[in-house]
């Protein structure tokens, strides 16, 4: 069978080889498509409801005024010339529709290096067959599931037209110290060969590099955190970041009900004040960051305090946000 590719909505003429150029003709067209069950026979003297789909022209050719998805299938003509010689024509018709230019919607203007970011969603509407969407970074194809690249795809079919809408959401994790203005684009590749890809306009989000956080320092006075009963302990939370973050205090892992302050003074120490203290610095851009923990203890007169203080672990690092 001869392969024919026809655009949806366009007319199509299939020649009946060997047919006399004008009536009287002995010919018959048979079609097996999405509109037929088994074979439908159309003859030159036909004419009727099927004319809206396909009709035999005076020269014996079959005319389809506007090809549709349901016209995909096999078309056969059997003709006999004036001398009684029979000729058969056999066509396999496939249809296509090129969508409008794809677009990137919900695109990000800024990405953060080192963490997953949604770049945008590529949308293509009105294709047949469905075709595929692919993403490009600086002109080179992006491969999903490689180097922090992930793609979520969705295909929908219009209930009336049968045409496809494709959606592809791109997530990337930009490398630290990489290109500050990467160029992303998306392209639609048709499901049928010999049709060029359609590419979106590019987008160029900025990549923001988060400044690595310097550690929150907790300084205890007296050094080591051991103090005689009735003495005073001063805890100072030092944060290099600008602007100064809010400082809250924790004792034994529980927030203390105090107003934010970089200094915590414990006057007239008693047994109830013993425990492990830390401070939490809350940055508007980074979220909370906890210091190491220090242990405050009471020493009875005549006891030697610990030389370096009984210092706890390094804290929890950056707290996860609930």
């Amino acid at each position: 069978a001869q392969n024919i590719t026809a655009r949806i909505g366009e007319p199509l003429v299939l020649k009946c080889k060997g047919a006399p150029k004008k009536p009287p003709q002995r010919l018959e067209w048979k079609l097996n498509t999405g509109r037929t069950e088994a074979w439908k026979v159309l003859s030159p003297q036909g004419g009727g409801p099927w004319d809206s789909v396909a009709r035999v022209l005076p020269n014996g050719s079959l005319f389809l005024p506007a090809v549709g998805i349901q016209d995909e299938g096999i078309f056969r003509c059997q003709a006999m010339n004036r001398n009684g010689k029979e000729t058969k024509s056999n066509y396999r018709v496939r249809v296509y529709q090129i969508p409008g230019k794809p677009e990137i919607v919900d695109s990000a203007s800024e990405l953060t290096a080192g963490v997953p970011n949604k770049v945008g969603t590529c949308v293509s509407e009105g294709s047949y067959p469905a075709g595929t969407l692919s993403w490009h970074l600086d002109g080179k194809p992006l491969v999903p599931n490689e180097k922090g690249v992930s793609v979520k795809e969705q295909t929908r079919r219009h209930p009336e037209t049968g045409l496809f809408t494709l959606q592809s959401e791109l997530m990337v994790t930009p490398a630290r110290g990489g290109d500050p203005r990467p160029t992303f684009s998306c392209s639609f590749s048709p499901g049928l060969p010999r049709h060029r890809a359609l590419r979106t306009a590019p987008i160029q989000p900025r990549v923001w590099e988060p400044v690595p956080l310097e550690e929150v320092q907790l300084v205890v006075e007296p050094e080591g955190g051991a103090v005689a009963p009735g003495g005073t302990v001063t805890l100072t939370c030092e944060v290099p970041a600008q602007p100064s973050p809010q400082i809250h205090w924790m004792k034994d892992g529980v927030p203390l009900p105090l107003p934010p302050s970089p200094v915590l003074i414990l006057p007239e120490i008693g047994p109830q004040d013993q425990g492990t203290y830390s401070c939490v610095a809350t940055h508007s851009s980074h979220g909370p960051q906890e210091s190491r923990a220090v242990s405050i203890s009471i020493i009875e007169p005549g006891e030697e305090g610990p030389t370096a203080g009984s210092v706890g672990g390094s804290g929890l690092g950056t707290l996860a946000l609930a």
Epitope: R35, E37, P49, W50, D51, S52, V53
Partner: antibody, heavy 119, light 107 residues
């Protein structure tokens, strides 16, 4: 909303003529075939004529061929039925309907207009 | 020309009954049969298109089926508003041919 409104019916003598009109709205008129169907009082439905979307091809049953002519004006979203040499048996309610082909078969109908052929 | 033989020409039924109406085509018409409902003084309304497809806005108690050249309209549970006349239509070939109609009356 698809709407089809017939007009032009009435009383006519045998041998006389009448022209029915159908005003279409709510859809792209020139994308569709159009059809006239009639129903004699107390009887069933009978196909009268169809026309393709361009107006180039028309179709009739033997009962009205050479007497009735279906036509359309796509610019005016209008369908017509010119009825000549009318007979008593043409008395019926005449309905205009969208479609009549393989793609869209009589999906929407008008409310009909009564044609009475009597002396 | 194709003939569409519709049966029965009338039937009496009660609300809640299952009703079946049949049309037989005199030759192969593929899937190209519609069913219509008509109430007195009103235009026909398409119920089923291409033998088995329910038209928009038509209750799911209506269904269509096909076996060769036999086409069936079924109302699974008759409702008061379903008392009307039903027609089949063949649109595979000209002349388009309607069945003779089936009048569904209250028992």
């Amino acid at each position: 909303e698809v709407q089809l409104v017939e007009s032009g019916g009435g009383l006519v003598q045998p041998g006389g003529s009448l022209r029915l009109s159908c005003a279409a709205s709510g859809f792209t008129f020139n994308n569709y075939w159009m059809t006239w169907v009639r129903q004699a009082p107390g009887k069933g439905l009978e196909w009268v004529a169809s026309i393709d979307n361009s107006g180039d091809n028309t179709y009739y049953p033997d009962s009205v061929k050479d007497r009735f002519t279906i036509s359309r004006d796509n610019a005016k979203n209008s369908l017509y039925l010119q009825m000549n040499s009318l007979r008593a048996e043409d008395t019926a309610v005449y309905y205009c309907a969208r479609g009549g082909d393989i793609l869209d078969s009589l999906h929407f109908w008008g409310q009909g207009t009564l044609v009475t052929v009597s002396s | 020309d194709i003939q569409m033989t519709q049966s029965p020409s009338s039937l009496s039924a009660s609300v809640g009954d299952r009703v079946t109406i049949t049309c037989r085509a005199s030759q192969d018409v593929g899937i190209y049969v519609n069913w219509f409902q008509q109430k007195p003084g009103k235009a026909p309304r398409r119920l089923i298109y291409r033998a088995t497809n329910l038209a928009d806005g038509v209750p799911s108690r209506f269904s269509g089926s096909r076996s060769g050249t036999d086409f069936t309209l079924t109302i699974s549970s008759l409702q008061p508003e379903d008392f009307a006349t039903y027609y089949c239509l063949e649109f595979d070939e000209h002349p388009l041919t309607f069945g003779g109609g089936t009048k569904v009356e209250i028992k």
